[in-house]
């Protein structure tokens, strides 16, 4: 902490300008009025202050606003935002999307820092849900943002926000996250026609149940293997050879290259070998011909 010293004669700052970069730390503390700093925060970003000088400016704002900065100051923090701790940010009440964008811009190109994570958390909680504009903004800065949320947090995403989601935003989502997002996407895109619907829903299909995959198999969608490999194993297992053939269309030939991988290998084990042979792909490991296999799904449900 900088000790209190009187401002030398003639050095009292009347505005925030470049002359301040020549001030020593104690001079900044003594000669810059915190209220002046707060009203002219937008100028700080244009001045090449050292990290040590920024520490002094932060200290002055902390003294002026011990309960947390007002949004008028937060919006113009610029690089001073990088000096904030998550504890500082938890005191803020950020409601403007413009403020959020301004602060995210400062951190652009870097990994999501604890400060940014806290800021986003405060902003989203303040809004009560992850609306489309917010999601649009966050995924623009952090494509992996959506997949960093827990399934519980994702449950607050309204279906209308799903329109803002791009395929790359879902790249790192795990099955439990897609389980939450898929029903929302299904609802959001429900009024689209067949081929357009498939284009939109495709990225979310890792959360689709068996009955929806069966329905898609009747619509000539020609699902690619990359999408098929991301489907829930338990959703794929009940599909028949004919249904998988219809679902994949010309891409069915790709099953051979994936026969050792999930969910393909699990699905193969549950198909009759003579049904697999009808595909002409040389898939092996199905139920040997002549075996009598009972449907045990009811037995398992009861046990």
């Amino acid at each position: 902490e900088v000790e209190k010293t009187a401002c030398p004669s003639g050095k009292k700052a009347r505005e925030i300008d470049e002359s301040l970069i020549f001030y020593k730390k104690w001079e900044l503390e003594a000669c810059v009025d915190a209220a002046l700093l707060a009203t002219q925060m937008d100028r700080v970003n244009a001045i090449p202050f050292t990290y040590e000088q920024l520490d002094v400016l932060k200290h002055k704002l902390d003294e002026l606003y011990p309960q947390g900065y007002p949004e008028s100051v937060i919006q113009h923090l610029g690089y001073l935002f990088l000096k904030m701790s998550p504890e500082d940010i938890r005191k803020w009440n950020v409601t403007s999307l413009e403020t959020l964008k301004a602060l995210l811009e400062v951190n652009k190109g870097h990994e999501m820092s604890p400060q940014v994570a806290t800021l986003i958390d405060r902003f989203v909680k303040g809004r009560g849900q992850l609306d489309k504009d917010t999601l649009d903004t966050l995924t623009a800065f952090y494509p992996g943002y959506l997949c960093s949320l827990s399934p519980e947090e994702l449950s607050s995403v309204p279906p209308s926000s799903i329109w803002a989601v791009r395929p790359q935003d879902l790249d790192t989502c795990d099955p439990r996250q897609l389980d939450v997002l898929y029903p929302k996407a299904r609802l959001a895109f429900q009024n689209m026609n067949g081929s357009e619907y498939f284009v939109k829903i495709q990225s979310f299909l890792g959360g689709a149940p068996t009955e929806d995959l069966k329905a898609l198999s009747q619509q000539n969608v020609s699902m690619d293997l990359a999408t098929f490999m991301k489907l829930r194993t338990d959703a794929v297992l009940p599909l028949t050879v004919a249904e998988v053939q219809k679902l994949l269309g010309p891409h069915v030939e790709g099953l051979k290259a994936e026969e050792r991988h999930r969910p393909v290998r699990d699905w193969i084990l549950r198909q009759r070998q003579d049904d697999l042979d009808t595909l002409g792909l040389g898939l092996q490991g199905g139920i040997p011909n002549g075996y009598l296999v009972l449907d045990l799904s009811m037995q398992e449900a009861l046990s």
Epitope: P175, T233, R260, R262, R265, L269, R270, Y291
Partner: antibody, heavy 118, light 107 residues
């Protein structure tokens, strides 16, 4: 709670066939949710997957052992078995049977040590 | 075959320490990764399945994270009964493969 118990000879001569059986209690090998696996661990070393069988008789073996391995299932006895032919000293290991759920990992038997020696 | 590389191969820690073990797959395995604990003379015991799901009955000090090729097992506060060898295992592709193990010893 399901229990798996390995049984079979603890000593096998080189070039002979190792035979082990795993008896499942408290659950059924006919369950459609599980594969029934064999895994081994040479003394002081890591774990090696041998293969698994599904109740229908479908099998999947480790390519490195495929030519010597046969896994079978007997649903009437609630057992599954391992046969490993042409054994050498390198096959000396603790052999584990395990239940493999397709998304929930392996639940293991206690294991049985098989020594290959003349 | 998918190679699983665990690090470190051994570590010394004290009761109460936070311990992190990493596992790297030679290609993407999505979330198909399990963690096991093995004590001398005993069978491995499942701790974590599907990369981050805690097996029933396993203490909450164990947690798993990761997706694709890089995975982590964390013990938040090491207890005396946690000194053991830990293995990761991929279940995405056959042959199923295991990491070489990480032995956690008392410092």
């Amino acid at each position: 709670q399901v229990q798996l118990q390995e049984s079979g000879p603890g000593l096998v001569k080189p070039s002979e066939t190792l035979s082990l059986t795993c008896t499942v209690s408290g659950g059924s090998v006919s369950s459609g949710s599980y594969y029934w696996s064999w895994i081994r661990q040479p003394p002081g070393k890591g774990l090696e997957w041998i293969g698994y069988i599904y109740y229908s008789g479908s099998t999947n073996y480790n390519p490195s052992l495929k030519s010597r391995v046969t896994i079978s299932v007997d649903t009437s006895k609630n057992q599954f078995s391992l046969k490993l032919s042409s054994v050498t000293a390198a096959d000396t290991a603790v052999y584990y049977c395990a239940r493999d759920h397709y998304e929930r990992g392996l639940y293991w038997g206690q294991g049985t040590l098989v020594t290959v020696s003349s | 075959d998918i190679q699983m590389t665990q690090s470190p191969s051994s570590l010394s820690a004290s009761v109460g320490d936070r311990v992190t073990i990493t596992c790297r797959a030679s290609q993407s395995i999505s979330s198909y990764l399990n963690w096991y604990q093995q004590k001398p003379g005993k069978a491995p015991k499942l701790l974590i399945y599907a990369a981050s799901s805690l097996q029933s009955g396993v203490p909450s000090r164990f947690s798993g994270s990761g997706s694709g090729t890089d995975f982590t097992l964390t013990i938040s506060s090491l207890q005396p009964e946690d000194f053991a060898t830990y293995y990761c295992q991929q279940s995405y592709s056959t042959p199923l493969t295991f990491g070489g193990g990480t032995k956690v010893e008392i410092k």
